[in-house]
């Protein structure tokens, strides 16, 4: 159940997709990736207020218990709901190869 | 890739399964659930230090970028990797029914 997409904290403050530019050095990939040398990393960032983009029943429970016991139970967290594939040209023992990674870049976000 | 299960922050401080006792009132279910009247909610709580239980490549990237830009990129978050089903006896217009929920109780945790 993908709940409300209205952010009560103000525009852009709640869980959504962000793009962060990163070099191979930033990612710790410089010793095994040849291309691309800069990655536009898409990731899920932002707050998860009550029922905002709740991924499932578990997220709804978490919201309820966080309200009751904020020191014990954390609020739901903004994480990828799905991923986009990304292809890397990487070094191998014999030369180079193209490798597709399916769990590298976030496509869509929800709270869980 | 399920990375290291050794918690550098000390025993029990990192991402793991916790059990929280909750009443139907706590969960906001009192008006539609008949049983159980108390739920042992299993949820994922704890810190996600570098490479601890990294769910996938995205979690590894997030760790790297959080180290570089802690104010922009949050650390990975402790969320369910899988769920246990739970059966609720719930009120219906005509009486009661047994309903199985597959996304309610965490079974296993990882960082993402």
């Amino acid at each position: 159940a993908r709940n409300g997409d209205h952010c009560p904290l103000g525009p852009g403050r709640c869980c959504r997709l962000h793009t962060v530019r990163a070099s191979l050095e930033d990612l710790g990939w410089a010793d095994w990736v040849l291309s691309p040398r800069e990655v536009q990393v898409t990731m899920c960032i932002g707050a998860c207020p009550s029922q905002f983009r709740a991924a499932n029943m578990h997220a709804q429970i978490k919201t309820s218990l966080h309200r009751l016991k904020p020191d014990t139970v954390p609020a739901p967290c903004c994480v990828p709901a799905s991923y986009n594939p990304m292809v890397l040209i990487q070094k191998t023992d014999t030369g180079v190869s193209l490798q597709t990674y399916d769990d590298l870049l976030a496509k869509d976000c929800h709270c869980i | 890739a399920r990375n290291g299960d050794h918690c550098p922050l000390g025993p029990g401080r990192c991402c793991r399964l916790h059990t929280v006792r909750a009443s139907l009132e706590d969960l906001g279910w009192a008006d539609w659930v008949l049983s159980p009247r108390e739920v042992q909610v299993t949820m994922c709580i704890g810190a996600c230090p570098s490479q601890f239980r990294a769910a996938n490549m995205h979690a590894q990237i997030k760790t790297s970028l959080h180290r570089l830009k802690p104010d922009t990129v949050p650390a990975p978050c402790c969320v369910p990797a899988s769920y246990n089903p739970m059966v609720l006896i719930q009120k219906t217009d005509t009486g009661v029914s047994l309903q199985t929920y597959d996304d309610l109780l965490a079974k296993d945790c990882h960082c993402i």
Epitope: R37, E38, V39, Q40, T42, N84, I89 | -
Partner: antibody, heavy 119, light 112 residues
């Protein structure tokens, strides 16, 4: 089968704009960049810019500043390049090609769209 | 911008002969790990270009092994060990070391 499909030709009047399409199939559209390359009749190849379908971010050669706008529609796996204020200098074949990133070789090319700017 | 210069601009050889063509860049294309951001393309009449060699020496999928790329820094060579009639084309080198990506002027190969 991995391919990039482009319309064969466009005939446009000077001063007008044109929006060319490049439809990807046979691979995950958002996993690769789309680059655009210009080739004037009997001339060499000229890189125009790239579009990252995953984010919508673009980059183009300074020479084409104000001339080119690159967009994409992920629902139809199609990249677009719009050229504005057309002159005879814009008459050329325009190719789209895919690359792993901004700095990677172009392993698949479209057949090209021949743009003719004429009154 | 990096200027790419190819020579000769054209050459005519008989089938079975060995051919070499040169590509020179105005600055080094060498990056880490000893790879150069230099690719070679073949364009037959009335067709789009086709990738032959990427990252200075790696044959693209399906390219016959008579095509070989070599060189480093600013000087690169494409060698066709035994020219076939179907190799009639213009050959372009391209640098993707930095933006804007630039192509050489091409070498036109004619078969006697």
């Amino acid at each position: 089968q991995v391919q990039l499909q482009q319309p064969g030709a466009e005939l446009v009047k000077p001063g007008a704009s044109v929006k060319m399409s490049c439809k990807a199939s046979g691979y995950p559209f958002e996993g690769w960049y789309i680059h655009w390359v210009k080739q004037r009749p009997g001339q060499g190849l000229e890189w125009m810019g790239w579009n990252n379908p995953r984010t919508g971010l673009t980059n183009h050669a300074q020479k084409f500043q104000g001339k080119v706008t690159m967009t994409r529609d992920t629902s139809s796996s199609t990249a677009y390049m719009q050229l504005s204020s057309l002159t005879s200098e814009d008459s050329a074949v325009y190719y789209c090609a895919r690359g792993v990133g901004a700095d990677a070789a172009f392993d698949i090319w479209g057949q090209g769209t021949t743009l003719t700017v004429s009154s | 911008d990096i200027v790419m210069t190819q020579s000769p601009s054209s050459l005519s050889v008989s089938a079975g002969e060995k051919v070499t063509m040169s590509c020179r860049s105005s600055q080094s294309l060498l990056w880490k790990h000893g790879y150069n951001y230099l690719d070679w393309y073949q364009q037959k009449p009335g067709q789009p270009p086709k990738l032959l060699i990427y990252l200075d020496r790696n044959r693209a999928h399906g390219v016959p092994d008579r095509f070989t790329g070599s060189g480093s820094g600013t000087d690169f060579t494409l060698t066709i060990s035994s020219v076939q009639a179907e190799d009639l084309a213009v050959y372009y080198c391209m640098q993707s070391f930095e933006t804007p990506i630039t192509f050489g002027g091409g070498t036109k190969l004619e078969i006697k």
